[in-house]
Amino acid sequence: MAVTACQGLGFVVSLIGIAGIIAATCMDQWSTQDLYNNPVTAVFNYQGLWRSCVRESSGFTECRGYFTLLGLPAMLQAVRALMIVGIVLGAIGLLVSIFALKCIRIGSMEDSAKANMTLTSGIMFIVSGLCAIAGVSVFANMLVTNFWMSTANMYTGMGGMVQTVQTRYTFGAALFVGWVAGGLTLIGGVMMCIACRGLAPEETNYKAVSYHASGHSVAYKPGGFKASTGFGSNTKNKKIYDGGARTEDEVQSYPSKHDYV
């Protein structure tokens, strides 16, 4: 029961996290104009991974996409890549974890298969969360660097009394959404990995040893450890007594649930 709950909760937390990562990636407010001493501004600038926007006091908002690929900073490209990798891994992880859920029965899928799928999805969620956190952190670092650089050049004299006020950018809402979402995906992944251990029982799987005696010929089949994972319970230790002698090939083998050739 606890395993099912842990797995289910891990799935839900990861689902929320990945939805958050997608939302953060699509959001325009990765960086917003720093208003420092002026909380009300006539022109407010904010930027996302895909476009930059300007909101005027009039209420008019204009967004322009970055219609260049080569002209964009390498860091921005790296952040985009990390977020997309995070989304793709997360989406695959969600797909895998749906089939791995203990509460959902699909055909005659064994617990070990579900355990493996749970572990796989858990790892995917962890990597997805780390990608998102890394992407957001790289962008945040870029902002901090640019912020202090533009603060140093805050007012550039243009001769006489003319001044150019440089626009400084600070953390936008998308960064916080990304950090939280990445964290949730990471937590969900860890929960899936924990659930995986519970899904796979501890007993070592010993296969039955079959003796077939007929007169003096004894057919002995040591079938015990063929590709066994060591997880799962196979307590069907069957001894087969048959009056007739068999060749080794004729001796029945009872494969474990975990025999993968």
Epitope: T41, S58, G59, F60, T164, V165, T167
Partner: antibody, heavy 118, light 113 residues
Framework: DVQLQESGPDLVKPSQSLSLTCTVT?????????WHWIRQFPGNKMEWMGY???????NYNPSLRSRISITRDTSKNQFFLQLNSVTTDDTATYYC???????????WGQGTSVTVSS | DIVMTQSPSSLTVTPGEKVTMTCKSS????????????LTWYQQRPGQPPKMLIY???TRESGVPDRFTGSGSGTDFTLTISSVQAEDLAVFYC?????????FGGGTKLEIK
């Protein structure tokens, strides 16, 4: 089309309060945009005074902040200017306007001339 | 506050002539976010409220004759009337639309001979 019309007293005594009304037709003041007051002094110099946002929030010119108040009556689709402790320097033509793209003012009332004199 | 300085303060021209008036701001009105200059030009005929001609420094308001052209960037802006008409007798103002408080230039009075 949006139309604005100012109304109020022509003459105000120094140290008193000046109260003006702007009646808007053709657009609801709660639907969008900022609704501004701008005044023009006798020498043609113009001064932006402040605005009320369609949500009800306000923003004023720092030079007037201590004595200005812009409010509204949504049921009558009107917004108001109150300027306290007036002096003869407040003698001007007062315009109500609505902002548009580029933070520009394409919509103006006809203006109301106010003289501050004892 | 951004100070707007207009020149000349007045000029007299004959109909059909080309007119240029300038507006300088104490700070740049250019916004890098959308590559636009936040400057507006108004025309005020005698006894009337101002009428907006140009916004974003060079975008003509609908219904404004194409003889009015706005140009410039940063701190230096120009309003050009390619062929002055008698009805152009007015005072022309520029406005800082970039930061609060919005400020206006002192105006350029256009008189017709």
């Amino acid at each position: 089309d949006v139309q604005l019309q100012e109304s109020g007293p022509d003459l105000v005594k120094p140290s008193q309060s000046l109260s003006l009304t702007c009646t808007v037709t053709g657009y609801s003041i709660t639907s969008g945009y900022n609704w501004h007051w701008i005044r023009q002094f006798p020498g043609n110099k113009m001064e932006w005074m402040g605005y009320i946002h369609y949500t009800g929030s306000t923003n004023y010119n720092p030079s007037l902040r201590s004595r200005i108040s812009i409010t509204r009556d949504t049921s009558k689709n009107q917004f108001f200017l109150q300027l306290n402790s007036v002096t003869t320097d407040d003698t001007a033509t007062y315009y109500c306007t609505r902002i548009y793209n580029g933070n520009s003012f394409p919509y103006w009332g006809q203006g109301t001339s106010v003289t501050v004199s004892s | 506050d951004i100070v707007m300085t207009q020149s000349p303060s007045s000029l007299t021209v004959t109909p059909g002539e080309k007119v240029t008036m300038t507006c300088k701001s104490s700070q740049s009105l250019f916004n890098s976010g959308n590559q636009k200059n936040y400057l507006t030009w108004y025309q005020q005929r005698p006894g009337q409220p101002p009428k907006m001609l140009i916004y974003w420094a060079s975008t003509r308001e609908s219904g404004v004759p194409d003889r009015f052209t706005g140009s410039g960037s940063g701190t230096d802006f120009t309003l050009t009337i390619s062929s002055v008409q008698a009805e152009d007798l007015a005072v022309f103002y520029c406005q800082n639309a970039y930061s609060f408080p919005y400020t206006f230039g002192g105006g350029t009075k256009l008189e017709i001979k």
